[in-house]
Amino acid sequence: EVEKTACPSGKKAREIDESLIFYKKWELEACVDAALLATQMDRVNAIPFTYEQLDVLKHKLDELYPQGYPESVIQHLGYLFLKMSPEDIRKWNVTSLETLKALLEVNKGHEMSPQVATLIDRFVKGRGQLDKDTLDTLTAFYPGYLCSLSPEELSSVPPSSIWAVRPQDLDTCDPRQLDVLYPKARLAFQNMNGSEYFVKIQSFLGGAPTEDLKALSQQNVSMDLATFMKLRTDAVLPLTVAEVQKLLGPHVEGLKAEERHRPVRDWILRQRQDDLDTLGLGLQGGIPNGYLVLDLSMQEALS
């Protein structure tokens, strides 16, 4: 911390300009009025201050606003935002999407920092839900943002916001997250026709139940193998060979290359071998002809 010393004669800052880069830390502390700094924050970003000088400027703002900065200052923090701690940010009340964008721009190209995570958390909590515009903004800066949320947090995403989601935004989502997002996507896209609907819903299908996959198999969707491999194993297992053949269309041939991987491996084990043989792909491991299949889970439930 810089000790308090009187400002040398003639050095009192009348505005925030480049002459301040020639000030020593103690001179900045003594000669720059915090209220002036707050009203001219936008100028700070165009001046190549050292990190040490920025520390002094931050200290001055902290003294002026011990309860947290007003949004008029936050919006113009620019690269001074990188000096803020999560504790500082928790004191803020950020309501404007423009403010959020301005601060995300500063961190652009970098991993999501604890500061940014705290900022987003404060912003979303303030809004009460992840509306479409917010989601649009966040996924533009951080494509993996959606998948960083817990299923509980995702439950606050309204179906209307799903329109903002791009396939790459879901790349790192796990099944628990897709379980929450899929019903929202289904609701969001429900008024679309078959082929358009499938294009939109495709990246969410990792959360689809068996009955929805059965329904899709009746619509000539030609699901690709990459999508099929991301489906829930428990949703795939009850599908018949005929249903999988209809679901995949011409892509059914790809099953052979994936026969050792889930969910294909587990699905093969549940099918009758003679049904698998009808595909003509040489898939092996099905239930031999003449064997009786007992559903042990059903038996356990009865006993």
Epitope: E18, N45, A46, G78, A102, E105
Partner: nanobody, 117 residues
């Protein structure tokens, strides 16, 4: 995205050096540039400044009349011409860029060493 300084070295008092600050990975056109120096055990201090357009320059009192800053946007480089060097000019000189799109970017170089002895 980085700034690379060069041109430092050992020079006798009264001699001259020209330092360069070159940007790689981004264009300097929209950035204001500052030259700073840090002598061993001392606080880093501002030496010179040039605006993004090149129309405005400024200098620390200790170097006025001896140092001159200029920029060549075509070469993506800013220069610091240092004449009549003194032993107290010794230090590591680094450049910083501030501004860019939305005034939200800044970059620092690693520095180049100047010894006047």
């Amino acid at each position: 995205l980085q700034l690379v300084e060069s041109g430092g070295g050992l020079v006798q008092p009264g001699g001259s050096l020209r330092l360069s600050c070159a940007a790689s990975g981004f264009t300097l056109d929209y950035y204001a540039i500052g030259w700073f120096r840090q002598a061993p055990g001392k606080e880093r201090e501002g030496v010179s400044y040039i605006s993004s357009s090149g129309g405005s320059t400024n200098y620390a009192d200790s170097v006025k009349g001896r140092f001159s800053i200029s920029r060549d946007n075509a070469k993506n480089t800013v220069y610091l011409q240092m004449n009549s060097l003194k032993p107290e000019d010794t230090g590591v000189y680094s450049c910083a860029a501030a501004g860019g799109y939305g005034n939200s970017s800044r970059h620092w170089g690693q520095g180049t060493s100047v010894t006047v002895s």
